[in-house]
Interface confidence: low
């Protein structure tokens, strides 16, 4: 059993290492602010792949079973409060990056086999949004994202599992905001 776990872990570490590099690349890029419409876009084809769509939803469901705290919502109307439609993709980019860095990577050994497939997929989406910026002040967006981060941090591991349980909503929200 230990050997099996080790082989799964080593396979996963390779996958996650690639994902981490992708993420580091996008974090380093930064770049000057560009008009919203030019880079805050994802191709519709990213959300039209039955296999990875299903794996993302299965991962969310698996995580749902591991947490009984059904009263707290992370991705909901409050997240988008005061954020215009044209800024929502940028907002979701922030949520996606936080979810990858602070939730999925630390929990990478759980919820197999879905995690090892979904994390690289989400990391690719994150990479494609690396040049997505908005012109002007984004404080209102950062404030909303910070509330989500604070909620996850306050709940500890339970918050991380809750975030994984909401990957279905993250997927749908990214689709709605970014295509």
């Amino acid at each position: 059993m230990a050997a099996l776990q080790k082989s799964v872990s080593s396979f996963l570490m390779g996958t996650l290492a690639t994902s981490c590099l992708l993420l580091l690349a996008l974090l380093v890029q930064g770049g000057a602010a560009a008009p919203i419409s030019s880079h805050c876009r994802l191709d519709k084809s990213n959300f039209q792949q039955p296999y990875i769509t299903n794996r993302t939803f299965m991962l969310a469901k698996e995580a749902s079973l591991a947490d009984n705290n059904t009263d707290v919502r992370l991705i909901g109307e409050k997240l988008f409060h005061g954020v215009s439609m044209s800024e929502r993709c940028y907002l979701m980019k922030q949520v996606l990056n936080f979810t990858l860095e602070e939730v999925l990577f630390p929990q990478s050994d759980r919820f197999q086999p879905y995690m090892q497939e979904v994390v690289p997929f989400l990391a690719r989406l994150s990479n494609r949004l690396s040049t997505c910026h908005i012109e002007g002040d984004d404080l209102h967006i950062q404030r909303n994202v910070q509330k989500l981060k604070d909620t996850v941090k306050k709940l500890g591991e339970s918050g991380e599992i809750k975030a994984i349980g909401e990957l279905d909503l993250l997927f749908m929200s990214l689709r709605n905001a970014c295509i």
């Epitope: 039209q48 296999y51 939803f57 469901k61």
Partner: antibody
Framework: QVQLVQSGAEVKKPGASVKVSCKAS????????MHWVRQAPGQGLEWVGW????????FYAQKFQGRVTMTRDTSINTAYMELSRLGSDDTAVYYC??????????????WGRGTMVTISS | QAVLTQPSSVSGAPGQRVTISCTGS?????????VHWYQQLPGTAPKLLIY???NRPSGVPDRFSGSKSGTSASLAITGLQAEDEADYYC???????????FGTGTQLTVL
């Protein structure tokens, strides 16, 4: 056994809102997505949206976005669908339907009996 | 409204075989999403008949079978019986709409 029991028939005036409930029993409510589907008299089935009872997160068909709200109360294993700004073309039977646990093949496995909503001035 | 197209009606004599087609597009059936079939008897809620293209839930007779090819699917009913008279709907997931879609519905008449 698994059952979905829906609230009774409603008659509403144009412009009003209606809230239909769906009480689940015989299974763990938070483990399964719940869908809402409607059927106008003599017409086909139309998907309204789904709610994830675990998170409370909902996703709606584009046609209904801005007009529909799906919620749930996990303490009483009940899902709700509220439709606002009702018009005569919203007259229909509204069904709740539970999806199987595996999302590989999303479909409506268990159905409620439906709630007839009539819009009449 | 409906994204999946079905014939409005089909009919057959008892004991015969009938098929109901369901035509979609590259964003639903053709994209690889499963096709599911429902039977709706008059005045009742729909009942799941076939899921994931060709699987039967327990309790559904093996007279009912489903298949899928390309952007289309079909439901076959063999040994037609009077109690099979109902409306039949296909359903899938559509990635361009990011939602579930139903067929237009087919009324089956047993002659």
């Amino acid at each position: 056994q698994v059952q979905l029991v829906q609230s009774g028939a409603e008659v509403k005036k144009p412009g009003a809102s209606v809230k239909v409930s769906c009480k689940a029993s015989g299974y763990t409510f938070t483990h399964y997505y719940m869908h809402w589907v409607r059927q106008a008299p003599g017409q086909g089935l139309e998907w309204v949206g789904w709610i994830n009872p675990y998170t409370g997160g909902a996703f709606y068909a584009q046609k209904f976005q801005g007009r529909v709200t799906m919620t749930r109360d996990t303490s009483i294993n009940t899902a709700y669908m509220e439709l606002s700004r009702l018009g005569s073309d919203d007259t229909a039977v509204y069904y709740c339907a539970r999806e199987p646990e595996k999302f590989d093949s999303p479909n409506a496995e268990i159905w409620g009996r439906g709630t007839m909503v009539t819009i009449s001035s | 409204q409906a994204v999946l197209t079905q014939p409005s009606s089909v009919s057959g004599a008892p004991g015969q075989r009938v098929t109901i087609s369901c035509t979609g597009s590259s964003s639903n059936i053709g994209a690889g999403y499963g096709v599911h079939w429902y039977q709706q008897l008059p005045g009742t809620a729909p009942k799941l008949l076939i899921y994931g293209n060709s699987n039967r839930p327990s309790g559904v007779p093996d007279r009912f079978s489903g298949s899928k090819s390309g952007t289309s699917a079909s439901l076959a009913i063999t040994g037609l019986q009077a109690e099979d008279e109902a409306d039949y709907y296909c359903q899938s997931y559509d990635s361009s709409l990011s939602g579930y879609v139903f067929g237009t519905g087919t009324q089956l008449t047993v002659l």
